[in-house]
């Protein structure tokens, strides 16, 4: 592969990019080291962390992160105001709620300030990168003699934006039974055996109405219902992480 200096797009891809290309070289120059990828997640729409693998740099380098939104009043990049560090080297940026626009294309630029030609621009759909908090306040109630209802709460995110994965099992089950619940933070189990002890847990994701996040939240704290008889082989039915 030959190296080639080209002038790149003026939209946001500031000029004089050094690229590797298989086309005939116009200007020969040493290829630059690729920058690490930036990965961003929006945590419960409260803050966003954009991180990179700083240890992939051959020398300790304080890379800088700038960002903007595709459609905004001020089309210029702004520098990260709250860097995250790993071994005293920048490895991420935390962006606060007031700077998060879920439904605008997020443009993020990582740059080596010592070598301005070492620069990578990525575009991200933030609505697909939301990770909710684990569901909270799981409560069980009897709808009838054998019917149970499980309810829970999610903080800061509209219920209609979330999809839930409910898992339950009894002390006689080797594996979880699981099902998807859309938008409604409740689930009913039509038939329970009062001689069994049941465990329930829930997690959520920002999908599919308001975004298409594939990332599930952490599991809720488990809740239990039913007989407190000693399990025959407790180790066999230990709660999985």
């Amino acid at each position: 592969w030959s190296s080639k200096v080209l002038m790149s797009s003026a939209n946001e891809d500031i000029k004089a990019d050094l690229i590797l290309t298989s086309t005939a070289p116009e200007h020969l120059s040493a290829p630059t080291l690729p920058l690490p990828e930036v990965q961003c997640f929006v945590f419960n729409i409260e803050y966003m962390n954009c991180t990179w693998n700083s240890s992939s740099e051959p020398q300790a380098t304080n890379l800088t992160l700038h960002y903007r939104y595709k459609v905004s009043d001020n089309n210029t990049f702004q520098e990260c105001s709250h860097y995250l560090f790993s071994k005293e080297i920048t490895s991420g940026c935390q962006i606060q709620k007031e700077d998060i626009q879920l439904y605008q294309t997020f443009v993020v630029q990582l740059q080596d300030p010592q070598k301005p030609q070492r620069r990578a621009v990525q575009k991200l759909n933030l609505q697909n990168l939301v990770i909710p908090r684990a569901p909270e306040n799981l409560t069980l109630s009897n709808l009838s003699e054998s019917q149970l209802e499980l309810r829970w709460k999610s903080r800061h995110i509209k219920e209609r934006c979330l999809q839930y994965l409910v898992q339950y099992r009894s002390n006689r089950d080797r594996s979880w039974t699981e099902l998807i619940v859309n938008h409604e933070p409740r689930f009913s189990l039509p038939s329970v055996d009062e001689l069994k002890r049941y465990t329930f847990r829930v997690r959520s994701r920002y999908n599919p109405i308001c975004g298409s996040s594939q990332q599930w939240s952490k599991w809720s704290q488990p809740v239990h219902w039913g007989s407190h008889t000693v399990e025959e082989n407790p180790s066999l039915f230990a709660l999985e992480a």
């Epitope: 891809d13 690229i19 590797l20 630059t32 930036v38 990525q122």
Partner: nanobody, 126 residues
Framework: QVQLVESGGGLVQAGDSLRLSCVAS????????MGWFRKAPGKEREYVAI???????FYEDSVEGRFTFSRDNAKNTVYLQMNSLRPEDTAVYYC????????????????????WGQGTQVTVSS
């Protein structure tokens, strides 16, 4: 070694359509960020459409709604469907690939792409 070969360019009238193809050999594109770029005479190279392997696709403002990026991993091929072509779309169109770790990585900076095709000429007459 990865080779990218573009095809599908040509001379068309304003308002017509073209479909560009880019076939890769040497490695799978299934875990690559992909980009279509163009270079018009006297202008800088600019991105036209970029895509992460997770499926997020972004377009340059002037082509949004007219151009569509797609990929067929089974054929190791990416496409650029160009509709309602305009004279200002005249350029050499390049396909580019960047192996990435994350499904969400889509690069609009040309220096982020490791592999490039030789380009295919698209000319739109008025």
């Amino acid at each position: 070694q990865v080779q990218l070969v573009e095809s599908g360019g040509g001379l068309v009238q304003a308002g017509d359509s073209l479909r560009l193809s880019c076939v890769a050999s040497g490695r799978t594109l299934s875990r690559c960020a992909m980009g279509w770029f163009r270079k018009a005479p006297g202008k800088e190279r600019e991105y036209v459409a970029i895509s992460s392997w997770g499926g997020d696709t972004f377009y340059e403002d002037s082509v949004e709604g007219r151009f569509t990026f797609s990929r067929d991993n089974a054929k190791n091929t990416v496409y650029l469907q160009m509709n309602s072509l305009r004279p200002e779309d005249t350029a050499v169109y390049y396909c580019a690939a960047a192996p990435t770790s994350f499904a969400t990585t889509a690069y609009s900076s040309s220096n982020s792409y490791a592999y490039w095709g030789q380009g295919t000429q698209v000319t739109v007459s008025s």
